[in-house]
C-alpha cells in the first residue's frame, strides 16, 4: 500500500504563437481545480476507462480575473498535493491523465459552471520509494508543470511497496533469512503476510494476501491433498501410495503471461518468456519505442528512445487513448442544438441544422417563414423552429405543390362522408352534426355540464370534458 | 392536452351587450376548430357559433347576425362578442375545441351569461 503524490507547479500559456485567451474574465471570475486518474500498466484504454489504480481532486484555486489587455499569464493554482492512495503493489510501470478544470463564478443559475480547459496523459515507469519526477507536458496553447512520487506507507517498503518492514526485535540483527530494510537500517524486512489461514508447510506467497500451493497441494489455503487415482497422465510419482497425483492447478494454468507470452514451470512458481517488446513478471510491461510507429491515425510519437523510458502519443484531433486508436465521439456531447444533426468529420465538427436554425452549432432561430412560400394558395405557419404550410383545399406536401386527395386524411369528423370536389372537399355531416368539417355536434347528448361519460363517442373521435 | 378557460360572463339587460373570451393553452388555436355553445336551464347544450381550423365560421339561425365568432391567434384565444341580447340568450355557455391531429374535443368549465331587466 501507498500514495502516489502530484504537485502542480504551474498551468499556463505555453511558449511560441497562439497565446490561449484567459480563461476567466471580469465579467466571468473563475478559479481552477485539477483531476488525476491513474491506471496500472501501459493501459491502451481511452480517457474515459476507469481509473483502476485511484482518482483524486483538488482543492479549487484562488478565484482569478483578468485584468483587461494583459496577456494570460500562469493562473493562481491549489494549494497541496494531489494524494491518490494505492492498495495493493505499486505496478511500476503507469499511466496518467492531468485535467484542468475551470469553475466559472459569474451570474450562473443553478451554481457554478465547470468546464474542461485541458487534458493531458502519459505513461511512466516509477519506482516507489524514489525522489521526485518533474514533467512538462502540453495540451493545445497551454503548458502543465507538475512533479509526482510514489511512497509506500509503512510498513510496506520497495519499489512496488510489497516488502514489509518491522521494528527490529534484537538490536544487533535480523531474524534468519531476513535483510535489514534499506534505507531504515534500524528495521528488519518482514516475512510477507500470505492469506490468513494458508498452509505454512504446503503454501506459500508472492505477494501479500495470496496463497499458492506447493505441488501436491490445492484448495485456498493449500491444506487439501491432491487425491490420487490410477492417472493416465500423471505430473509426478507419489510418495503416499503406488498410484499417481491427479494433476492440481499448475502455476502455468490459465496461462499467466499476458501479450503472447509462453509460460514455463519452476520450482516454487512460473517464469514468463516474452515476445519481442514486452517484459515483466507476466509480460505485461510494453518496450514498445517510437521506432515500432506505436500511434495511429496520424499522431506524433514523443519519447521513448529505449525500451525503459515510455513513449507518449500526442493524438491528432478527433482520436484519443495512448495510441491515439480510439476515435473520440465528439457528436456523444451533443454540441449541436435545436434538434441539429451533428457530423463528426474527423478533422472538425458540423452541425446540419433543422429548417428555421441557422449557425455553427444551430443556435441561431430564424424566421421561420422568412423567404419561404407556399404554393397553391398555403399560407405559412411558423412554430418549433420549422416552417409549415398550411395548404389550400386540394393541395399537401411539405410547400403545398403536391395535388392531393382532398378525402385522403378523413376531414369529415364525427362520420361525415367526404366528397372530393374541383374546387376542393364536401363534407355531408352525420344527422346532429353542422360546420364546415362536421367538427361541431348541434346537440351534445346529456343534460348535465359534465356528463359522467362522453356522448356519442365514436372510434377515432373521442371526447374530453375538462 | 388542450385546457379551456372561458371568461367574461355576467349580467347584462336586454338589447346589451357581452364579449366572451376563451383562452386555450396546450395547443395552438389556429390548428383547432373551436365554438361556443350553450346550456340553458333544463334544456339540452346546443351549439351558438363555431369557427373552422380554416377560419370558416358557422352559427345557428337564432344568433346570426346578432353573435360574432372570431379568434386570435397571437393571444391564442377564441372570442364570441353577442349584441342584441334577449332574456332567451341566458344560459351557461362553454367553450369547445375539436383537435384535429388527435380527434379529440375538450370543453371548458362553462361561464354564465344572464339577460335579465
Known amino acids: 500500500a501507498g500514495v502516489f503524490e502530484l504537485q502542480i507547479h504551474s498551468f499556463g500559456p505555453g511558449p511560441g504563437p497562439g497565446a490561449p485567451r484567459s480563461p476567466c474574465s471580469a465579467r466571468l471570475p473563475c478559479r481552477l481545480f485539477f483531476r488525476v486518474c491513474l491506471k496500472p500498466g501501459l493501459s491502451e484504454e481511452a480517457a474515459e476507462s476507469p481509473c483502476a489504480l485511484g482518482a483524486a481532486l483538488s482543492a479549487r484555486g484562488p478565484v482569478y480575473t483578468e485584468q483587461p489587455g494583459a496577456p494570460a499569464p500562469d493562473l493562481p493554482l491549489p494549494d497541496g498535493l494531489l494524494q491518490v492512495p494505492f492498495r495493493d503493489a505499486w505496478p511500476g510501470t503507469f499511466s496518467f491523465i492531468i485535467e484542468t478544470w475551470r469553475e466559472e463564478l459569474g451570474d450562473q443559475i443553478g451554481g457554478p459552471a465547470w468546464s474542461l480547459l485541458a487534458r493531458v496523459a502519459g505513461r511512466r515507469r516509477l519506482a516507489a520509494g524514489g525522489p521526485w519526477a518533474r514533467d512538462i507536458q502540453r495540451a493545445g496553447a497551454w503548458e502543465l508543470r507538475f512533479s509526482y512520487r510514489a511512497r509506500c506507507e509503512p510498513p510496506a517498503v520497495g519499489t512496488a511497496c510489497t516488502r514489509l518492514c518491522r521494528p527490529r526485535s534484537a538490536p544487533s540483527r535480523c531474524g534468519p533469512g531476513l535483510r535489514p530494510c534499506a534505507p531504515l537500517e534500524d528495521e528488519c524486512e518482514a516475512p510477507l503476510v500470505c492469506r490468513a489461514g494458508c498452509s505454512p508447510e504446503h503454501g506459500f506467497c508472492e505477494q501479500p494476501g495470496e496463497c499458492r500451493c506447493l505441488e501436491g497441494w490445492t484448495g485456498p489455503l493449500c491444506t487439501v491433498p491432491v487425491s490420487t487415482s490410477s492417472c493416465l497422465s500423471p505430473r509426478g510419482p507419489s510418495s503416499a501410495t503406488t498410484g499417481c497425483l491427479v494433476p492440481g492447478p499448475g502455476p502455468c494454468d490459465g496461462n499467466p503471461c499476458a501479450n503472447g507470452g509462453s509460460c514455463s514451470e519452476t520450482p516454487r512458481s512460473f517464469e514468463c518468456t516474452c515476445p519481442r517488446g514486452f517484459y515483466g513478471l507476466r509480460c505485461e510491461v510494453s518496450g514498445v519505442t517510437c521506432a515500432d510507429g506505436p500511434c495511429f491515425n496520424g499522431g506524433l510519437c514523443v519519447g521513448g528512445a529505449d525500451p525503459d523510458s515510455a513513449y507518449i502519443c500526442h493524438c491528432p484531433p478527433g482520436f484519443q487513448g495512448s495510441n491515439c486508436e480510439k476515435r473520440v465521439d465528439r457528436c456523444s456531447l451533443q454540441p449541436c442544438r435545436n434538434g441539429g444533426l451533428c457530423l463528426d468529420l474527423g478533422h472538425a465538427l458540423r452541425c446540419r441544422c433543422r429548417a428555421g436554425f441557422a449557425g455553427p452549432r444551430c443556435e441561431h432561430d430564424l424566421d421561420d417563414c422568412a423567404g419561404r412560400a407556399c404554393a397553391n394558395g398555403g399560407t405559412c405557419v411558423e412554430g418549433g423552429g420549422a416552417h409549415r404550410c398550411s395548404c389550400a383545399l386540394g393541395f399537401g406536401g411539405r410547400d403545398c405543390r403536391e395535388r392531393a386527395d382532398p378525402c385522403a386524411a378523413r376531414p369529415c369528423a364525427h362520420g361525415g362522408r367526404c366528397y372530393a370536389h374541383f374546387s376542393g372537399l364536401v363534407c355531408a355531416c352525420a344527422p346532429g352534426y353542422m360546420g364546415a368539417r362536421c367538427e361541431f355536434p348541434v346537440h351534445p347528448d346529456g343534460a348535465s355540464a359534465l356528463p359522467a361519460a362522453p356522448p356519442g363517442l365514436r372510434p377515432g373521435d373521442p371526447q374530453r370534458y375538462l | 392536452e388542450v385546457q379551456l378557460v372561458e371568461s367574461g360572463g355576467g349580467l347584462v339587460q336586454p338589447g346589451g351587450s357581452l364579449t366572451l373570451s376563451c383562452a386555450a393553452s396546450g395547443s395552438s388555436v389556429k390548428f383547432l376548430s373551436m365554438a361556443w355553445y350553450r346550456q340553458a336551464p333544463g334544456k339540452k347544450r346546443e351549439l351558438v357559433a363555431g369557427?373552422?381550423?380554416?377560419?370558416?365560421?358557422d352559427y345557428i339561425l337564432s344568433v346570426k347576425g346578432r353573435f360574432t365568432i372570431s379568434r386570435d391567434n397571437a393571444k391564442n384565444s377564441v372570442y364570441l362578442q353577442m349584441n342584441s341580447l334577449r332574456a332567451e340568450d341566458t344560459a351557461v355557455y362553454y367553450c369547445y375545441a375539436y383537435e384535429w391531429t388527435t380527434r379529440y374535443t375538450y370543453w371548458g368549465q362553462g361561464t354564465l351569461v344572464t339577460v335579465s331587466s
Open positions: 369557427i373552422s381550423a380554416d377560419g370558416s365560421t
